[in-house]
């Protein structure tokens, strides 16, 4: 199809070589076409309504994305040629940064419903550049955390070094939906809830004497609980004695609950105490058996091929530790009678 009639938009993606980063392009079809093609998302029971600019058809492939090769070859269908680019309804997700993402991307309705729709397309000229050392040293990360229940803010990485007074008008999106009330380089959240997590996009316009373009950055925001102030607790074993049968195999499980920590280095191990000696036992790897927003439960087993008389004189100790402190639970084996 002839792309000369497509509306054109220029975008700049300046990526950090230090961190993983994603990027998105929205199929900004001219109104009113936009409303025909991009699907309005159903709100989940825990989300709050936002301004929804895209609504309409339910079809997953409402729009078609192409890349225009620089050598003048025919347009290429994104889905067939670019595994690191994913189409999600009207959004194109770039999973990895790199100057090789530079180029012209075209989107248009998949179903042409009227003669006018033939010319309904957008050409996005994307320039991708690595961030130079001259750029701000302390720019905001593309992965930002918000502490549940507290006040927080989300900063636009490409503008985080500028004061609010100098900052140009910013357009913010959350999960592809326009946040119409947000216009500054920072979104302030009075009280953080789990629905505040998601993919945020901040856009602002930059110009020179010749042209203007949109500078875009993508921020992955996650909501987290504060780092635990507690040492881990052992949920199992609860009792300090265990009845066993001599000569039979035995598995003793240690299950410990560790509170959330951003830097999580849990320790869970078994050691044996025999009179004045104690030594760590080589046991199977620890494994996570449950994870919630606030904590994680890790299990590690000690396996005895067969219980001996000597084992009855020993203490089996489970030791668990996080950055706050450690806890132990010892188990003494007792022969089952009768």
């Amino acid at each position: 199809f002839n792309i000369s009639g497509c509306s054109t938009k220029k975008l700049l993606w300046t990526y950090s070589t230090r961190s993983e980063e994603e990027f998105v392009l929205f199929c900004d079809l001219p109104e009113p076409q936009k409303s025909h093609f991009c699907h309005r998302n159903r709100l989940s029971p825990k989300q709050v309504p936002e301004h929804l600019p895209f609504m309409g058809s339910n079809d997953l492939s409402d729009v078609q994305w192409y890349q225009q090769p620089s050598n003048g070859d025919p347009l290429e269908d994104i889905r067939k040629s670019y595994p690191h680019i994913i189409q999600d309804k009207c959004t194109l997700h770039f999973l990895t940064p790199g100057v090789n993402n530079s180029g012209s991307y075209i989107c248009r309705p998949k179903m042409i419903k009227s003669p006018y729709d033939v010319a309904c397309c957008v050409k996005m000229i994307l320039e991708v550049k690595p961030q130079t050392n001259a750029s701000c040293e302390y720019s905001a990360s593309h992965k930002q955390d918000l502490l549940l229940g507290s006040t927080g803010s989300i900063s636009c990485p490409s503008l985080s070094c500028q004061s609010d007074a100098q900052s140009p008008a910013v357009t913010w999106y959350k999960n592809g939906k326009l946040l119409s009330v947000e216009r500054s380089n920072r979104i302030v959240v009075d009280e953080v809830y789990d629905y505040h997590q998601g993919t945020y996009v901040c856009d602002y316009t930059q110009s020179d004497t010749v042209s203007s373009w949109t500078v875009r950055a993508v921020v992955q925001v996650r909501t987290i609980v504060g780092d635990t102030k507690l040492k881990p607790d052992i949920l199992d074993p609860v009792e300090d004695t265990l009845e066993v049968e001599l000569g039979k195999p035995l598995t003793i499980s240690c299950k410990a609950r560790f509170g959330f920590e951003r830097v999580f280095n849990p320790v869970i191990k078994w050691y044996i105490k025999d009179s004045d000696l104690e030594w760590e036992v080589s046991v199977p790897e620890a494994k996570s058996i449950k994870s919630t927003l606030k904590d994680e439960i890790i299990e590690r087993n000690i396996i005895l091929e067969k219980v001996t008389q000597r084992d009855l004189r020993r203490k089996f100790v489970c030791f668990v530790q996080n950055s706050i402190g450690n806890t132990t639970q010892s188990v003494q084996l007792k022969e089952k009678r009768g």
Epitope: H93, N175, D194, T199, Q220, V221, I224, K290, S291
Partner: antibody
Amino acid sequence: SLEESGGDLVKPGASLTLTCTASGFSFTSTYWMSWVRQAPGKGPEWIGCIVTGRGNTYYANWAKGRFTISKTSSTTVTLQMTSLTAADTATYFCARGSSDEIALDLWGQGTLVTVSS
Amino acid sequence: AAVLTQTPSPVSAAVGGTVTISCQSSQNIYNKNQLSWFQQKPGQPPKLLIYEASKLASGVPSRFKGSGSGTQFTLTISDVQCDDAATYYCLGGYISSSDTTFGGGTEVVVK
């Protein structure tokens, strides 16, 4: 929203992979993405989940070994099923939890898997 | 393995009345409160009503109330409406996620 795909009519012993595609949010954040199945006329059955921001996977005791849940991109999660039998015939749902695998606040419409010779 | 036993079906309720559904666990629920309630209508996926035993999910009318702790839980629907006719399921979590399980369901019939 969530959308499941890949449901099909397959023969006993076959394998099948179902895909759950998220729209309006991405799995770069931490979500408990569960797979739940429901046989015709029966109650739902929890299969397992993946914690997207952390990579941990958990399975119901009965599902261990035959079912594998993976995050394949920032918007897709899959359920691989092997050695299928007639007892696996069900509608398979993917569902999202924001704090654990129990408070499932967003569900897809489901995809039907029929195992029959 | 853990088992969640629900009030036998069907349970009848008159419009404007109150209905109570119980869910009993064979072992302690994690944190004594990791239990959710869902409503399901034919041809639809389950819908979250209550999480953490007593917290109301967003958009759910306050006529739905969850209570209980440990092994015994209850869902109460007051001022029953015709639209409440559905099957209700509890879902419980335990120390190990491998034990996560749904209750057998309770059908509510509104007269």
